[in-house]
Interface confidence: low
């Protein structure tokens, strides 16, 4: 099941509790603890910007702050993908990019960030209070999603700084994410804490304004964005989403599909019966949607007379039932 992962703001213990220690003694343990807690906990940032030249044109930029390899990025609007959101674009590192109106141009900016331009005219145009979400599937972190919208006060041409916006969700937070060094650090921290626990409390009254330990990551977000991490699922205002995208194409369906040339001239072996994966061969790991990892080629257990179709442990369409990419 989905779990909400929010990076905790690490508060040092209240003075006077557990044998109050001077804050200088605490710096190393708390830096280490910060590392231990946040190790392998990636973040997704989302930046929404209105173009100054075209007031109904938006640029959405998203990035993944994690060490894993990205296997898929899904951009949606109107809410998280799978929770009422509508897919705008899907970017796959090997298979290419697909987008639907009103997405005009989706592209990779770096190996871990993407941008999407939305053109707004007619019924399918976005507007200032539309929520855009980016979901990054990566190994080993799992699936992470963040959402954002244009800041209410922003002028055309301006944008909010890229922040890990209201939604930060991990289906599998940091599997295998703690490196040996951090593991050692955590063990050392426990050792320190145990020593402190058994040591008599110093008589000195600690400063009541001892600063918080810094987040020990080069990419630690600003204070404002840290605050955003603690906002639960955003209330999504969909009043400005198109009443229907059918006006763009009356017959509906994925008629706004666009693709880059793909490299898949062969049929990669997929995981489950009519499941398929965007990976080239058996034996490699694939990203997960909702929590379980499996190696490509592992067939899930049969569930009755038929084969288990889509529900590969790797997620909704890392295996794609009878219907998907091979």
């Amino acid at each position: 099941m989905r779990t909400e992962a929010q990076v905790p703001a690490l508060q040092p213990p209240e003075p006077g509790l557990e044998g109050a220690m001077g804050h200088r003694t605490l710096v190393l343990p708390w830096v280490l603890l910060t590392l231990c807690v946040t190790a392998g906990t990636p973040e997704v940032w989302v930046q929404v910007r209105m173009e100054a030249t075209e007031l109904s044109s938006f640029t959405i930029r998203c990035g993944f702050l994690g060490s894993g390899s990205i296997s898929l990025v899904t951009v949606s609007w109107g809410g998280p993908n799978g929770a009422g959101g509508t897919t705008l674009a899907v970017l796959h590192p090997e298979r290419g990019i697909r987008q639907w109106a009103p997405a005009r141009q989706a592209r990779w900016e770096t190996q871990s960030s993407i941008s999407l331009i939305l053109e707004g005219s007619g019924a399918s145009s976005p507007c200032a209070n539309t929520t855009f979400c980016c979901k990054f599937a990566s190994f080993p972190e799992g699936s992470w999603e963040a959402c954002g919208s244009l800041p209410p006060s922003s002028d055309p041409g301006l944008s909010a700084p890229p922040t890990p916006a209201p939604i930060l969700r991990a289906d599998l937070a940091g599997i295998l994410g703690v490196s040996g060094v951090l593991l050692f650090g955590c063990v050392y921290l426990l050792h320190l804490l145990r020593r402190h626990k058994h040591r008599p409390a110093p008589r000195l009254q600690p400063s009541r304004t001892s600063p918080q330990a810094p987040r020990a990551r080069a990419w630690a977000p600003s204070q404002a964005s840290q605050a955003a991490l603690h906002v639960p699922y955003a209330t999504i205002n969909t009043s400005c989403r198109p009443a229907t995208l059918d006006t763009a194409h009356p017959h509906g369906g994925p008629s706004w599909w666009a693709s880059l040339p793909t490299h898949a001239a062969h049929r990669p072996q997929g995981p489950a019966a009519w499941a398929s994966t965007p990976i080239p061969a058996r034996g490699s790991f694939v990203s997960v949607e909702n929590g379980l990892y499996a190696q490509a080629g592992e067939r899930p257990p049969h569930t009755g007379p038929g084969l288990t179709l889509f529900p590969d442990p790797r997620g909704p369409r890392a295996m794609e039932g009878p219907l998907g990419v091979r």
Epitope: V90, R267, A273, W274, M319, L323, V325
Partner: antibody, heavy 121, light 112 residues
């Protein structure tokens, strides 16, 4: 734009065979798993079979086992469904369908226009 | 095979009013990864089926937001918040959990 364009209507006699084609455009067949669904007049939808990426083979619904053959010509990006030993109850509209929305499972979101097969003596 | 049962089989609606269709499966469609492998399709008169909702609640691209899917396990619901004249047709649910995928018998939505 992804499109599936099917061959025209067919009228067949009982015991004969019919071969329906489904031409893919806007995507390559090798990247899709094509499936076939039929609908008898006034009835619901019935899945017949489709490509299984796990084994690189086509799987068929038990009901049609031995009578249906699904093949592909990747050089022309065309999928075929052949049904043999036709009976009057095989009179139906036959659809090819595939799922191409994203790389996760999001349903059969592209369908051909359907091919009407009438079996009558 | 997984048996899919829809109700009602016929649903007269008034434009602007909400509508709801139920779909029940003989086995749970909730997989251990948290997804419900259930799709909703609409077949308008004389047309091919069209995907509306996948994975129980994921609206397909281009589908108006008046359509929403909910439910988990064996009980699912498709809701239309405000029916429009163009929404008439037959609505099918389909389970995508086991081979063969199976469809409900369909719910015919027509204007009163």
């Amino acid at each position: 734009e992804v499109q599936l364009v099917q061959s025209g209507a067919e009228v067949k006699k009982p015991g004969a065979s019919v071969k329906v084609s489904c031409k893919v455009s806007g995507y390559t067949l090798t990247e899709l798993s094509m499936h076939w669904v039929r609908q008898a007049p006034g009835k619901g939808l019935e899945w017949m079979g489709g490509f299984d990426p796990e084994d690189g083979e086509t799987i068929y619904a038990q009901k049609f086992q031995g009578r249906v053959t699904m093949t592909e010509d990747t050089s022309t990006d065309t999928a075929y469904m052949e049904l043999s030993s036709l009976r009057s109850e095989d009179t139906a509209v036959y659809y090819c369908a595939t799922g191409v929305t994203t790389y996760y499972y999001y349903g059969m979101d592209v369908w051909g226009q359907g091919t009407t097969v009438t079996v009558s003596s | 095979d997984v048996v899919m049962t829809q109700s009602p089989l016929s649903l007269p609606v008034t434009p602007g009013e909400p509508a709801s269709i139920s779909c029940r499966s003989s086995q749970s469609l909730l997989y251990s990864n948290g997804n419900n492998f259930l799709d909703w399709y609409l077949q308008k008169p004389g047309q091919s089926p069209r995907l509306l909702i996948s994975l129980g609640s994921n609206r397909a691209s281009g589908v108006p937001d008046r359509f929403s899917g909910s439910g988990s396990g064996t009980d699912f619901t498709l809701k239309i918040s405000r029916v429009e004249a163009e929404d008439v047709g037959i609505y099918y649910c389909m389970q995508a959990l086991q081979t063969p995928p199976t469809f409900g018998q369909g719910t015919k939505v027509e204007i009163k």
